[in-house]
Interface confidence: medium
């Protein structure tokens, strides 16, 4: 069983104040106003930011823009109609789409990734769709903290 | 839906619900937010079926305690039943514990629509027999 216990932190529009995440043997703790799911914590913004602004906001909270393990990772919000910035960008050096931690995008995650404009950033809809947009466009964003 | 409400308000059921939760744990595949656990259903049910489905999970049909929670839930899921109903259009909207629900519910003047649904950041009335996605909640 996963479990998540509340920490009484109240953020304003950004993901929240810096906080060391607490772990115990059977509990994952997420900050107030973050969502806990499968022992990950997610901050789902309702405010629109550029990709870089989003990346910095997540980083300032000891988290990163969403890195997807698989397309059902955000199963709990698969009926959402919004698109969100995720932590995927094109590396000229590696000529590949990379996540923020440097790992490469699996070709199975977004079969259409070859059509993405490499100058753009990637916005993701939790039902599994992704599209490339100018990084200067403003979108909602999702931060992720992996607890295990 | 009044007969089901009486069953839902039965104190032994409430006790069982409380005993099923311990150590602040959420069941697998549920999400947590602000000290509550949520089951985000994908199945469509009538309002009464949804009530029973949540009861079988030792939880309650989605209740919305404040507008911050409503905004969060609207991000997660554009539409779902909530635990607010009325016996007829001549009766007030009430929550599962029988308290009057004071916030605006759209289309309330339609006598056919006596169960409430959260729909894209808005509370609306709907036919209780409609098949709509449901979510369950329990407080930690």
């Amino acid at each position: 069983k996963n479990s998540f216990t509340k920490l009484s932190i109240e953020p304003a529009f950004t993901p929240g104040p810096n906080i060391e995440l607490q772990k115990d043997s059977d509990c994952c703790s997420c900050q107030e106003k973050w969502v806990g799911y499968r022992c990950n914590c997610y901050f789902i913004s309702s405010e629109q930011k550029t990709w870089n602004e989003s990346r910095h906001l997540c980083a300032s909270q000891k988290s990163s823009l969403l890195q997807l393990q698989n397309t059902d990772e955000l199963d709990f919000m698969s009926s959402s109609q919004q698109f969100y910035w995720i932590g995927l960008s094109y590396s000229e050096e590696h000529t590949a789409w990379l996540w923020e931690n440097g790992s490469a995008l699996s070709q199975y995650l977004f079969p259409s990734f070859e059509t993405f404009n490499t100058k753009n950033c990637i916005a993701y809809n939790p039902n599994g769709n992704a599209l490339d947009e100018s990084c200067e466009d403003k979108n909602r964003y999702i931060c992720k903290q992996q607890l295990i | 839906p009044s007969t089901l409400i009486q069953r839902h308000n039965n104190s032994s059921l409430n006790t069982r619900t409380q005993k099923a939760r311990h150590c602040g744990h959420c069941p697998e595949e549920w999400i947590t937010y602000s000290n509550s656990c949520y089951y985000i259903g994908k199945e469509r049910r009538t309002w009464e079926e949804s009530l029973l489905a949540c009861t079988s999970k030792n939880s309650s049909l989605l209740s919305i305690d404040n507008e911050e929670e409503m905004k969060f839930l609207s991000i997660i899921s554009p539409s779902s039943w909530i635990g607010v109903f009325r016996n007829s259009s001549h009766h007030p909207w009430v929550t599962m514990n029988g308290l009057a629900f004071k916030h605006e519910i759209k289309d309330s003047d339609n006598a056919e629509l006596n169960c409430a649904v959260l729909q894209v950041n808005r509370l609306k009335s709907a036919q209780c027999g409609s098949s709509i996605i449901y979510h369950c909640k329990h407080k930690l």
């Epitope: 953020p11 304003a12 629109q48 | 404040n66 609207s74 605006e104 950041n121």
Partner: antibody, heavy 118, light 107 residues
């Protein structure tokens, strides 16, 4: 009857500060998000800031971010806007407005004039 | 930020006319759009929310339609008290934004 009454406006020099207040009555203030909206003379409406019912969520327009601070005191049924580093372009009538559980602004105050001029 | 473009910016009409004002969003906002009426020296007044829902107490000659990016406010038969400025507003995402306004004048 729902009432929102703004106060605290006036003339201030560029770089100066002002604190606006909005006194609410006739509804359960602590259940509602509140907003500030402004309107420069002869211009359209511009949303300034929002604060959720228990202050957990706060939002600002880019034009005021870092200079203005929204806050509320639910015990006093009051909403505030602290405005620092004021500029000429902040000159406007400032309105406070109520949200009804995600509905747009269903009640507005009468507005208060803020003039930033040397 | 989501930009809202209203058209026309101003229009002249007569009592009894049917009037349509449009509002276009720079990106999809589902049905999260409101319409307000403002008279000189007064605060705005909410007319329509959710793109098409009439606020209680607002005359039924006002109606709204649309979803996604294109929205319309219609006044079916203009009354003398309807001459004012009308604004659309999106509340899909922060920052919230208003259209630039449409001034409705007596012909």
């Amino acid at each position: 009857e729902v009432q929102l009454v703004e106060s605290g406006g006036g003339l201030v020099k560029p770089g100066g500060s002002l604190r606006l207040s909005c006194a609410a009555s006739g509804f359960t203030f602590s259940s509602h998000s509140m907003n500030w909206v402004r309107q420069a003379p002869g211009k359209g409406l511009e949303w300034v800031s929002a604060i959720s019912s228990s202050s957990s969520y706060i939002y600002y327009a880019d034009s005021v971010k870092g200079r203005f601070t929204i806050s509320r005191d639910n015990a006093k049924n009051s909403l505030y806007l602290q405005m620092n580093s004021l500029r000429a372009e902040d000159t406007a009538v400032y309105y406070c407005a109520r949200e009804e559980w995600g509905l747009p602004f269903d009640y507005w105050g009468q507005g208060i004039l803020v003039t930033v001029s040397s | 930020a989501i930009q809202l473009t209203q058209s026309p910016s101003s229009l002249s009409a007569s009592v009894g006319d049917r009037v349509t004002i449009t509002c276009r969003a720079s990106q999809g906002i589902q049905s999260a759009l409101a319409w307000y009426q403002q008279k000189p020296g007064k605060a705005p007044k909410l007319l329509i929310y959710d793109a098409s829902s009439l606020k209680s107490g607002v005359p039924s000659r006002f109606s709204g339609s649309g979803s996604g990016t294109d929205f319309t406010l219609t006044i079916s038969s203009l009354q003398p008290e309807d001459f004012a400025t009308y604004y659309c507003q999106q509340f899909n995402s922060y920052p919230l934004t208003f259209g630039q306004g449409t001034r409705l004048e007596i012909k």
